[in-house]
Protein backbone atom coordinates (compact mmCIF):
# COMPACT_ATOMS: atom_id res chain seq x y z
CA UNK A 1 0.00 0.00 0.00
CA UNK A 2 1.44 3.35 -1.02
CA UNK A 3 -0.14 6.61 0.04
CA UNK A 4 0.87 9.84 -1.64
CA UNK A 5 -0.03 13.40 -0.83
CA UNK A 6 -0.28 16.49 -2.96
CA UNK A 7 1.64 19.61 -2.18
CA UNK A 8 0.84 22.57 0.08
CA UNK A 9 -1.83 22.31 2.75
CA UNK A 10 -5.35 22.89 1.48
CA UNK A 11 -4.33 21.92 -2.04
CA UNK A 12 -3.31 18.35 -1.22
CA UNK A 13 -5.42 15.25 -1.63
CA UNK A 14 -4.58 11.72 -0.59
CA UNK A 15 -3.95 9.21 -3.36
CA UNK A 16 -3.46 5.52 -2.52
CA UNK A 17 -2.07 2.74 -4.69
CA UNK A 18 -1.48 -0.96 -4.10
CA UNK A 19 1.41 -2.84 -5.69
CA UNK A 20 0.08 -5.59 -7.90
CA UNK A 21 0.98 -8.20 -10.48
CA UNK A 22 -0.28 -8.87 -13.97
CA UNK A 23 -0.70 -12.26 -15.60
CA UNK A 24 0.69 -11.95 -19.13
CA UNK A 25 -1.88 -12.42 -21.88
CA UNK A 26 -4.71 -11.65 -19.47
CA UNK A 27 -6.24 -8.39 -18.22
CA UNK A 28 -4.80 -6.70 -15.16
CA UNK A 29 -5.76 -3.95 -12.72
CA UNK A 30 -3.51 -1.13 -11.50
CA UNK A 31 -5.20 -0.05 -8.31
CA UNK A 32 -5.52 3.63 -7.32
CA UNK A 33 -7.99 5.48 -5.12
CA UNK A 34 -8.27 9.13 -4.11
CA UNK A 35 -10.35 11.44 -1.94
CA UNK A 36 -13.58 11.67 -3.91
CA UNK A 37 -14.86 14.94 -5.35
CA UNK A 38 -18.49 15.67 -6.18
CA UNK A 39 -17.45 17.77 -9.18
CA UNK A 40 -16.91 15.07 -11.79
CA UNK A 41 -16.11 17.50 -14.59
CA UNK A 42 -13.18 18.84 -12.54
CA UNK A 43 -11.55 15.44 -11.95
CA UNK A 44 -8.43 14.61 -13.97
CA UNK A 45 -6.76 11.20 -13.77
CA UNK A 46 -3.35 10.68 -15.35
CA UNK A 47 -1.49 7.39 -15.41
CA UNK A 48 2.21 7.63 -16.23
CA UNK A 49 4.94 5.01 -16.49
CA UNK A 50 8.60 5.54 -15.66
CA UNK A 51 10.65 5.54 -18.86
CA UNK A 52 7.66 6.03 -21.15
CA UNK A 53 7.30 9.39 -22.90
CA UNK A 54 3.56 9.44 -23.57
CA UNK A 55 0.77 8.95 -21.06
CA UNK A 56 -0.48 5.52 -20.14
CA UNK A 57 -4.01 6.91 -19.81
CA UNK A 58 -5.80 10.19 -19.17
CA UNK A 59 -9.37 10.75 -18.03
CA UNK A 60 -10.74 14.29 -17.81
CA UNK A 61 -14.07 16.08 -18.03
CA UNK A 62 -15.87 12.77 -17.52
CA UNK A 63 -14.25 10.89 -20.40
CA UNK A 64 -11.05 9.39 -21.75
CA UNK A 65 -8.61 11.85 -23.33
CA UNK A 66 -6.16 9.70 -25.26
CA UNK A 67 -4.47 12.15 -27.62
CA UNK A 68 -1.24 12.01 -25.57
CA UNK A 69 -1.35 8.26 -24.99
CA UNK A 70 1.84 6.31 -25.65
CA UNK A 71 1.70 3.87 -28.55
CA UNK A 72 2.50 0.84 -26.37
CA UNK A 73 -0.77 1.32 -24.47
CA UNK A 74 -3.02 2.19 -27.43
CA UNK A 75 -6.34 0.36 -27.17
CA UNK A 76 -5.35 -1.48 -24.00
CA UNK A 77 -6.40 0.83 -21.15
CA UNK A 78 -9.62 1.91 -19.46
CA UNK A 79 -10.66 3.48 -16.18
CA UNK A 80 -13.86 2.52 -14.40
CA UNK A 81 -15.69 5.67 -15.48
CA UNK A 82 -18.74 5.04 -13.30
CA UNK A 83 -16.48 4.75 -10.24
CA UNK A 84 -14.42 7.92 -10.68
CA UNK A 85 -16.98 10.02 -8.79
CA UNK A 86 -16.44 7.87 -5.67
CA UNK A 87 -12.65 8.11 -5.85
CA UNK A 88 -11.67 5.06 -7.88
CA UNK A 89 -8.95 5.83 -10.43
CA UNK A 90 -7.91 2.21 -11.00
CA UNK A 91 -6.75 1.32 -14.49
CA UNK A 92 -7.73 -1.79 -16.39
CA UNK A 93 -4.88 -2.98 -18.60
CA UNK A 94 -5.84 -5.41 -21.36
CA UNK A 95 -3.61 -8.22 -22.61
CA UNK A 96 -0.79 -7.68 -20.11
CA UNK A 97 2.70 -7.89 -21.64
CA UNK A 98 5.98 -8.73 -19.92
CA UNK A 99 7.17 -5.21 -20.82
CA UNK A 100 4.28 -3.63 -18.86
CA UNK A 101 6.26 -4.23 -15.65
CA UNK A 102 7.64 -1.13 -13.98
CA UNK A 103 6.85 1.90 -11.87
CA UNK A 104 3.58 3.69 -12.57
CA UNK A 105 2.33 7.00 -11.19
CA UNK A 106 -1.33 7.67 -10.53
CA UNK A 107 -1.72 11.46 -10.65
CA UNK A 108 -5.01 13.08 -9.63
CA UNK A 109 -6.38 16.60 -9.90
CA UNK A 110 -9.75 17.52 -8.36
CA UNK A 111 -11.45 20.77 -7.39
CA UNK A 112 -9.94 20.21 -3.93
CA UNK A 113 -6.31 19.85 -4.99
CA UNK A 114 -3.70 17.50 -6.42
CA UNK A 115 -2.02 14.30 -5.36
CA UNK A 116 -0.13 11.30 -6.68
CA UNK A 117 1.24 7.93 -5.67
CA UNK A 118 3.55 5.40 -7.31
CA UNK A 119 2.79 1.76 -7.92
CA UNK A 120 5.16 -1.12 -8.65
CA UNK A 121 3.65 -3.41 -11.25
CA UNK A 122 5.16 -6.84 -11.75
CA UNK A 123 4.34 -9.04 -14.71
CA UNK A 124 4.70 -12.75 -15.18
CA UNK A 125 2.59 -15.84 -15.51
CA UNK A 126 0.92 -17.86 -12.80
CA UNK A 127 -1.76 -20.52 -12.80
CA UNK A 128 -3.52 -22.93 -10.50
CA UNK A 129 -1.92 -26.36 -10.11
CA UNK A 130 -3.91 -29.55 -10.33
CA UNK A 131 -2.74 -32.65 -8.51
CA UNK A 132 -3.81 -36.07 -9.70
CA UNK A 133 -2.97 -39.68 -9.00
CA UNK A 134 -0.80 -41.03 -11.82
CA UNK A 135 -2.27 -44.47 -12.45
CA UNK A 136 0.18 -45.13 -15.30
CA UNK A 137 3.18 -45.16 -12.97
CA UNK A 138 4.60 -48.37 -11.53
CA UNK A 139 4.37 -47.16 -7.93
CA UNK A 140 1.88 -44.89 -6.15
CA UNK A 141 2.64 -41.53 -7.81
CA UNK A 142 1.16 -38.03 -7.77
CA UNK A 143 1.40 -35.66 -10.70
CA UNK A 144 1.15 -31.88 -10.21
CA UNK A 145 0.57 -29.78 -13.33
CA UNK A 146 0.25 -26.04 -13.83
CA UNK A 147 -0.09 -24.73 -17.40
CA UNK A 148 1.53 -21.27 -17.29
CA UNK A 149 4.34 -19.87 -15.14
CA UNK A 150 7.02 -17.21 -15.61
CA UNK A 151 9.65 -16.57 -14.34
CA UNK A 152 10.58 -20.18 -13.66
CA UNK A 153 9.16 -21.12 -10.26
CA UNK A 154 10.33 -23.43 -7.54
CA UNK A 155 8.24 -26.51 -6.74
CA UNK A 156 8.13 -28.01 -3.26
CA UNK A 157 6.13 -30.99 -2.08
CA UNK A 158 4.83 -31.32 1.48
CA UNK A 159 2.69 -33.80 3.35
CA UNK A 160 0.40 -33.54 6.34
CA UNK A 161 1.64 -36.77 7.92
CA UNK A 162 5.38 -36.20 7.32
CA UNK A 163 5.54 -32.53 8.23
CA UNK A 164 8.93 -31.01 7.59
CA UNK A 165 10.01 -33.90 5.37
CA UNK A 166 12.14 -33.12 2.32
CA UNK A 167 10.62 -34.71 -0.78
CA UNK A 168 13.24 -33.49 -3.26
CA UNK A 169 14.80 -36.97 -3.47
CA UNK A 170 11.46 -38.62 -4.33
CA UNK A 171 10.15 -35.99 -6.73
CA UNK A 172 11.00 -34.87 -10.22
CA UNK A 173 10.09 -31.46 -11.68
CA UNK A 174 10.25 -30.40 -15.32
CA UNK A 175 9.51 -27.13 -17.13
CA UNK A 176 8.22 -27.21 -20.69
CA UNK A 177 8.25 -24.00 -22.75
CA UNK A 178 4.82 -23.08 -24.08
CA UNK A 179 4.22 -22.20 -27.73
CA UNK A 180 4.57 -18.43 -27.20
CA UNK A 181 8.15 -19.06 -25.97
CA UNK A 182 7.78 -17.15 -22.70
CA UNK A 183 5.64 -19.06 -20.23
CA UNK A 184 6.28 -22.62 -19.21
CA UNK A 185 4.22 -25.59 -18.20
CA UNK A 186 5.22 -26.97 -14.81
CA UNK A 187 5.04 -30.72 -14.20
CA UNK A 188 6.16 -32.27 -10.94
CA UNK A 189 5.91 -35.92 -10.04
CA UNK A 190 6.02 -37.29 -6.47
CA UNK A 191 6.86 -40.97 -5.97
CA UNK A 192 6.30 -43.43 -3.12
CA UNK A 193 3.01 -41.90 -2.03
CA UNK A 194 1.13 -43.43 0.90
CA UNK A 195 -2.64 -43.43 1.21
CA UNK A 196 -4.58 -41.71 4.01
CA UNK A 197 -2.38 -38.66 3.67
CA UNK A 198 -2.73 -35.13 2.27
CA UNK A 199 -0.02 -33.96 -0.11
CA UNK A 200 0.61 -30.38 -1.22
CA UNK A 201 2.37 -29.23 -4.37
CA UNK A 202 3.58 -25.65 -3.83
CA UNK A 203 4.66 -23.59 -6.82
CA UNK A 204 6.20 -20.18 -6.22
CA UNK A 205 8.03 -17.40 -8.04
CA UNK A 206 8.53 -13.74 -7.07
CA UNK A 207 5.03 -12.87 -8.29
CA UNK A 208 2.74 -15.61 -7.05
CA UNK A 209 2.46 -18.66 -4.86
CA UNK A 210 0.04 -21.46 -5.69
CA UNK A 211 -0.80 -24.64 -3.85
CA UNK A 212 -2.54 -27.79 -5.02
CA UNK A 213 -3.63 -30.23 -2.33
CA UNK A 214 -4.74 -33.83 -2.74
CA UNK A 215 -6.05 -36.14 -0.06
CA UNK A 216 -5.90 -39.78 -0.99
CA UNK A 217 -7.85 -42.35 1.00
CA UNK A 218 -8.95 -45.88 0.08
CA UNK A 219 -12.45 -44.70 -0.74
CA UNK A 220 -11.99 -41.25 -2.26
CA UNK A 221 -9.72 -38.50 -3.57
CA UNK A 222 -10.24 -34.86 -2.52
CA UNK A 223 -8.55 -31.93 -4.26
CA UNK A 224 -8.17 -28.27 -3.41
CA UNK A 225 -6.05 -25.49 -4.88
CA UNK A 226 -5.48 -21.82 -4.29
CA UNK A 227 -3.33 -19.02 -5.64
CA UNK A 228 -1.97 -15.95 -3.88
CA UNK A 229 -0.29 -12.93 -5.43
CA UNK A 230 2.83 -11.80 -3.60
CA UNK A 231 2.40 -8.03 -3.53
CA UNK A 232 5.51 -6.08 -2.68
CA UNK A 233 5.51 -4.22 0.62
CA UNK A 234 4.75 -0.53 1.07
CA UNK A 235 7.60 1.85 0.42
Amino acid sequence: LIIGFGISGRHSITVTTVASAGNIGEDGILSCTFEPDIKLSDIVIQWLKEGVLGLVHEFKEGKDELSEQDEMFRGRTAVFADQVIVGNASLRLKNVQLTDAGTYKCYIITSKGKGNANLEYKTGAFSMPEVNVDYNASSETLRCEAPRWFPQPTVVWASQVDQGANFSEVSNTSFELNSENVTMKVVSVLYNVTINNTYSCMIENDIAKATGDIKVTESEIKRRSHLQLLNSKAS
Partner: antibody, heavy 117, light 107 residues
Framework: QVQLVQSGAEVKKPGASVKVSCKVS????????MHWVRQAPGQGLEWMGA????????EYAQKFQGRVTLTADTSTSTAYMELSSLRSEDTATYYC??????????WGQGTTVTVSS | DIQMTQSPSSLSASVGDRVTITCQAT??????LNWYQQKPGKPPKFLIY???QLAEGVPSRFSGSGSGTDYTLTISSLQSEDFATYYC?????????FGGGTKVEIK
Protein backbone atom coordinates in the same frame (compact mmCIF):
# COMPACT_ATOMS: atom_id res chain seq x y z
CA GLN B 1 -25.82 -3.40 5.44
CA VAL B 2 -25.78 0.34 4.76
CA GLN B 3 -28.27 2.38 6.78
CA LEU B 4 -28.94 6.10 7.02
CA VAL B 5 -31.26 6.87 9.93
CA GLN B 6 -32.65 10.40 10.24
CA SER B 7 -34.12 12.28 13.18
CA GLY B 8 -37.87 12.74 13.63
CA ALA B 9 -40.32 15.24 12.23
CA GLU B 10 -40.08 18.90 13.27
CA VAL B 11 -42.56 21.79 13.45
CA LYS B 12 -40.97 25.23 13.43
CA LYS B 13 -42.06 28.84 13.38
CA PRO B 14 -40.99 31.22 10.59
CA GLY B 15 -37.57 32.75 11.33
CA ALA B 16 -36.49 29.81 13.48
CA SER B 17 -33.79 27.21 12.68
CA VAL B 18 -34.00 23.45 12.36
CA LYS B 19 -31.24 20.87 12.73
CA VAL B 20 -31.74 17.43 11.18
CA SER B 21 -29.43 14.49 11.90
CA CYS B 22 -28.48 11.48 9.81
CA LYS B 23 -26.72 8.55 11.48
CA VAL B 24 -24.75 6.31 9.14
CA SER B 25 -23.76 2.67 9.50
CA UNK B 26 -22.39 0.07 7.11
CA UNK B 27 -19.72 2.05 5.25
CA UNK B 28 -16.71 4.26 6.08
CA UNK B 29 -18.49 7.52 6.87
CA UNK B 30 -15.41 9.75 6.82
CA UNK B 31 -14.29 8.77 3.32
CA UNK B 32 -17.34 9.60 1.21
CA UNK B 33 -19.51 12.64 0.52
CA MET B 34 -22.87 12.95 2.24
CA HIS B 35 -25.52 15.02 0.50
CA TRP B 36 -28.79 16.63 1.52
CA VAL B 37 -31.77 16.77 -0.80
CA ARG B 38 -35.19 18.22 -0.06
CA GLN B 39 -38.66 17.69 -1.48
CA ALA B 40 -41.53 20.10 -0.97
CA PRO B 41 -45.01 18.50 -0.82
CA GLY B 42 -46.02 17.27 -4.28
CA GLN B 43 -42.81 18.66 -5.79
CA GLY B 44 -39.57 17.30 -7.19
CA LEU B 45 -36.15 16.74 -5.64
CA GLU B 46 -33.76 19.60 -4.96
CA TRP B 47 -30.08 19.27 -4.01
CA MET B 48 -29.06 21.48 -1.09
CA GLY B 49 -25.43 20.68 -0.36
CA ALA B 50 -22.86 18.08 0.62
CA UNK B 51 -20.16 17.43 3.20
CA UNK B 52 -16.99 15.34 3.12
CA UNK B 53 -16.79 14.26 6.79
CA UNK B 54 -13.11 13.30 6.72
CA UNK B 55 -12.06 16.89 6.09
CA UNK B 56 -15.28 18.78 6.84
CA UNK B 57 -15.23 20.09 3.26
CA UNK B 58 -18.62 21.46 2.26
CA GLU B 59 -20.35 22.45 -0.96
CA TYR B 60 -23.67 24.29 -1.04
CA ALA B 61 -26.28 25.04 -3.67
CA GLN B 62 -26.25 28.76 -4.40
CA LYS B 63 -29.90 29.02 -3.38
CA PHE B 64 -29.11 27.90 0.18
CA GLN B 65 -25.71 29.55 0.61
CA GLY B 66 -25.57 31.37 3.95
CA ARG B 67 -28.74 29.73 5.26
CA VAL B 68 -27.71 26.08 5.42
CA THR B 69 -24.85 24.65 7.47
CA LEU B 70 -23.65 21.09 7.09
CA THR B 71 -21.58 19.46 9.81
CA ALA B 72 -20.46 15.96 10.72
CA ASP B 73 -19.51 14.17 13.91
CA THR B 74 -17.04 11.49 12.87
CA SER B 75 -17.04 9.86 16.32
CA THR B 76 -20.72 8.93 15.93
CA SER B 77 -20.84 8.77 12.10
CA THR B 78 -23.59 11.36 12.10
CA ALA B 79 -24.18 14.14 9.59
CA TYR B 80 -26.21 17.26 10.40
CA MET B 81 -28.07 19.77 8.29
CA GLU B 82 -29.08 23.06 9.89
CA LEU B 83 -31.37 25.44 8.02
CA SER B 84 -31.90 28.90 9.46
CA SER B 85 -34.33 31.78 8.86
CA LEU B 86 -37.08 29.33 8.07
CA ARG B 87 -39.99 30.39 5.92
CA SER B 88 -43.18 28.59 4.88
CA GLU B 89 -41.66 27.49 1.57
CA ASP B 90 -39.06 25.47 3.52
CA THR B 91 -41.83 23.06 4.49
CA ALA B 92 -40.54 19.85 2.96
CA THR B 93 -39.12 16.41 3.55
CA TYR B 94 -35.36 16.53 3.96
CA TYR B 95 -33.24 13.55 2.94
CA CYS B 96 -29.62 12.66 3.54
CA UNK B 97 -28.14 10.55 0.77
CA UNK B 98 -24.71 9.01 0.37
CA UNK B 99 -22.28 8.80 -2.50
CA UNK B 100 -20.55 5.61 -1.46
CA UNK B 101 -20.57 3.28 -4.46
CA UNK B 102 -22.39 5.73 -6.74
CA UNK B 103 -24.03 9.15 -6.63
CA UNK B 104 -27.01 9.11 -4.22
CA UNK B 105 -26.94 5.34 -3.79
CA UNK B 106 -28.43 5.11 -0.28
CA TRP B 107 -31.06 7.38 1.25
CA GLY B 108 -32.30 8.17 4.73
CA GLN B 109 -35.99 7.68 5.43
CA GLY B 110 -36.59 11.43 5.33
CA THR B 111 -37.39 14.06 7.94
CA THR B 112 -40.52 16.18 7.55
CA VAL B 113 -40.06 19.82 8.53
CA THR B 114 -43.18 21.94 8.78
CA VAL B 115 -42.84 25.71 9.01
CA SER B 116 -45.99 27.31 10.31
CA SER B 117 -46.91 30.28 12.45
CA ASP C 1 -26.47 25.05 -13.78
CA ILE C 2 -27.44 22.24 -16.12
CA GLN C 3 -31.20 21.98 -16.55
CA MET C 4 -32.74 18.51 -16.87
CA THR C 5 -36.02 18.38 -18.78
CA GLN C 6 -37.92 15.19 -18.10
CA SER C 7 -40.83 14.07 -20.24
CA PRO C 8 -43.61 13.28 -20.04
CA SER C 9 -44.43 14.73 -16.63
CA SER C 10 -47.02 12.01 -16.19
CA LEU C 11 -48.31 9.02 -18.12
CA SER C 12 -51.03 6.40 -17.77
CA ALA C 13 -50.19 2.81 -18.61
CA SER C 14 -51.38 -0.73 -18.00
CA VAL C 15 -49.60 -3.73 -16.55
CA GLY C 16 -47.53 -5.31 -19.31
CA ASP C 17 -47.05 -2.06 -21.25
CA ARG C 18 -43.67 -0.85 -22.44
CA VAL C 19 -42.93 2.54 -20.89
CA THR C 20 -40.31 5.06 -21.98
CA ILE C 21 -39.27 8.16 -20.04
CA THR C 22 -36.76 10.67 -21.39
CA CYS C 23 -34.44 13.24 -19.88
CA GLN C 24 -32.78 16.01 -21.85
CA ALA C 25 -29.84 18.02 -20.51
CA THR C 26 -28.98 21.55 -21.57
CA UNK C 27 -25.43 20.37 -22.35
CA UNK C 28 -23.47 17.15 -22.82
CA UNK C 29 -23.37 15.30 -19.49
CA UNK C 30 -21.11 12.47 -20.73
CA UNK C 31 -23.36 9.62 -19.55
CA UNK C 32 -23.16 10.89 -15.95
CA LEU C 33 -26.83 10.23 -15.27
CA ASN C 34 -28.72 8.14 -12.74
CA TRP C 35 -32.40 7.19 -12.46
CA TYR C 36 -34.45 6.92 -9.25
CA GLN C 37 -37.88 5.54 -8.43
CA GLN C 38 -39.99 7.09 -5.69
CA LYS C 39 -43.24 5.91 -4.15
CA PRO C 40 -45.47 8.14 -1.97
CA GLY C 41 -44.09 8.68 1.54
CA LYS C 42 -40.84 6.89 0.74
CA PRO C 43 -37.33 8.08 -0.13
CA PRO C 44 -36.15 7.72 -3.73
CA LYS C 45 -34.76 4.30 -4.64
CA PHE C 46 -31.52 4.01 -6.63
CA LEU C 47 -32.40 2.36 -9.94
CA ILE C 48 -29.84 2.93 -12.70
CA TYR C 49 -26.38 4.46 -12.59
CA UNK C 50 -24.09 5.89 -15.23
CA UNK C 51 -26.83 5.86 -17.89
CA UNK C 52 -27.26 2.11 -18.32
CA GLN C 53 -25.99 0.12 -15.32
CA LEU C 54 -28.65 -1.54 -13.17
CA ALA C 55 -28.30 -1.00 -9.43
CA GLU C 56 -28.17 -4.10 -7.26
CA GLY C 57 -31.50 -5.92 -6.99
CA VAL C 58 -33.23 -3.95 -9.76
CA PRO C 59 -35.26 -6.17 -12.12
CA SER C 60 -33.98 -6.57 -15.68
CA ARG C 61 -37.19 -5.10 -17.13
CA PHE C 62 -35.63 -1.72 -16.32
CA SER C 63 -33.02 -0.41 -18.72
CA GLY C 64 -31.29 2.86 -19.45
CA SER C 65 -29.64 4.29 -22.53
CA GLY C 66 -28.41 7.53 -24.02
CA SER C 67 -25.44 9.77 -24.56
CA GLY C 68 -24.65 13.46 -25.02
CA THR C 69 -27.75 15.36 -23.92
CA ASP C 70 -30.47 12.73 -24.40
CA TYR C 71 -31.21 9.84 -22.03
CA THR C 72 -33.97 7.26 -21.72
CA LEU C 73 -35.38 4.98 -19.03
CA THR C 74 -37.38 2.03 -20.37
CA ILE C 75 -39.58 -0.41 -18.48
CA SER C 76 -40.08 -3.29 -20.91
CA SER C 77 -43.15 -4.78 -19.26
CA LEU C 78 -44.75 -2.65 -16.56
CA GLN C 79 -45.59 -4.44 -13.30
CA SER C 80 -48.01 -3.26 -10.61
CA GLU C 81 -45.11 -2.39 -8.29
CA ASP C 82 -43.63 -0.06 -10.94
CA PHE C 83 -46.35 2.58 -10.57
CA ALA C 84 -44.35 5.41 -9.04
CA THR C 85 -42.58 8.67 -9.87
CA TYR C 86 -39.24 8.48 -11.69
CA TYR C 87 -36.45 11.06 -11.55
CA CYS C 88 -33.25 11.47 -13.52
CA UNK C 89 -30.16 13.07 -11.98
CA UNK C 90 -27.12 14.51 -13.72
CA UNK C 91 -23.88 14.60 -11.73
CA UNK C 92 -21.46 15.64 -14.44
CA UNK C 93 -21.49 19.37 -13.78
CA UNK C 94 -21.74 21.00 -10.37
CA UNK C 95 -24.32 21.34 -8.84
CA UNK C 96 -26.08 18.00 -9.39
CA UNK C 97 -29.57 18.56 -10.79
CA PHE C 98 -32.70 16.43 -11.01
CA GLY C 99 -35.30 16.20 -13.72
CA GLY C 100 -38.80 17.32 -12.76
CA GLY C 101 -40.06 13.77 -12.44
CA THR C 102 -42.42 11.48 -14.37
CA LYS C 103 -45.43 10.04 -12.58
CA VAL C 104 -46.42 6.62 -13.95
CA GLU C 105 -50.09 5.99 -13.14
CA ILE C 106 -52.47 3.09 -13.70
CA LYS C 107 -54.64 3.51 -16.77
Amino acid sequence: QVQLVQSGAEVKKPGASVKVSCKVSGYPFTSYWMHWVRQAPGQGLEWMGAIYPGKSDTEYAQKFQGRVTLTADTSTSTAYMELSSLRSEDTATYYCTSTWTHYFDYWGQGTTVTVSS
Amino acid sequence: DIQMTQSPSSLSASVGDRVTITCQATQDIVKSLNWYQQKPGKPPKFLIYYTAQLAEGVPSRFSGSGSGTDYTLTISSLQSEDFATYYCLQFYEFPPTFGGGTKVEIK
